[in-house]
Amino acid sequence: RTTTCFGDGCQNTASRCKNGGTWDGLKCQCPNLYYGELCEEVVSSIDIGPPETISAQMELTVTVTSVKFTEELKNHSSQEFQEFKQTFTEQMNIVYSGIPEYVGVNITKLRLGSVVVEHDVLLRTKYTPEYKTVLDNATEVVKEKITKVTTQQIMINDICSDMMCFNTTGTQVQNITVTQYDPEEDCRKMAKEYGDYFVVEYRDQKPYCISPCEPGFSVSKNCNLGKCQMSLSGPQCLCVTTETHWYSGETCNQGTQKSLVYGHHHHHH
């Protein structure tokens, strides 16, 4: 956030940039958390994303019995590996076709025994506050589907009648990794020393990192005619003085008519 300075006073302003602001010859260039001519004001909202999508990766092992292992399958650039990859991918696309979060598979290693396939199942979902539940459910469905197919598509009399056949006991889920996104944590971190006063509120399923000085949210502080300003001790209302009134009180809701004060009378309304 930047504020331009014109005129002779600019040189003085240069040495007075606050809160880590730097002078660029015209103005104070303020760090993310601050704004104002001297970077003296704390912002009331911080952009914390979110990411458009959240990903998960499941490390799985299946044993393909309808293909005999050959040395060429160890080499990822061989024609054999490429053909196996294509057939395996097609088979898995069929297996997981009913899972909207399914993106694809990535073979990490092929090893002997008929062909033991170490691979990742990749999942992705649009970010919503419920993304963890969505991906947890998707990983459960992946487990169900791979268990089912490796139980059903098996060799009979040494012959497979499916695109691929599997060893029922060779299916294992090694690890599940979900991209972590914690808006509350991000909000606290980015608010630095003001972290205690910034909160996450959702609007249209999008998280907003805001202080009570940001209007339009349930935690917003109503300063009436005053101005909300953040300090290290929290949000405070700076009350204004108009031609006719002084305003005071925690939310500047107490107006005192100047004429009454000058006439030695106090009147609150």
């Epitope: 019995t65 005999k68 050959t70 691929m164």
Partner: nanobody
Amino acid sequence: DVQLVESGGGLVQPGGSLRLSCAASGFPSSRGTMAWFRQAPGKEREGVAFINSDGRTSYAESVKGRFTISRDNALSSLWLQMNSLRAEDTAVYYCAASLLYLMTVNAAAYPYWGQGTMVTVSS
């Protein structure tokens, strides 16, 4: 690029014989699996027989004892000797190949295909 070309199809009487050939180019003949599939009018493509690089063979129940699959790795050729042909053997016969050592009669496992040759068994 792998190319498979079938030949040897034709019209034959029930009980007769035919020998189908498949010439493979661009295919490393000493590796993988070669197979014969067939598709009768209005039916799904079905596996007839396959042969692996080490000579291991397998046949569909309906052709066991009547058909013989063989390959010559040096000539990059595949054959299907069909004896005691029946009306239900009428179909387009396809040659298929895979670089992998397969043990499946499912067409989806084979990436390389010929155009097919028609076999009609009729009196």
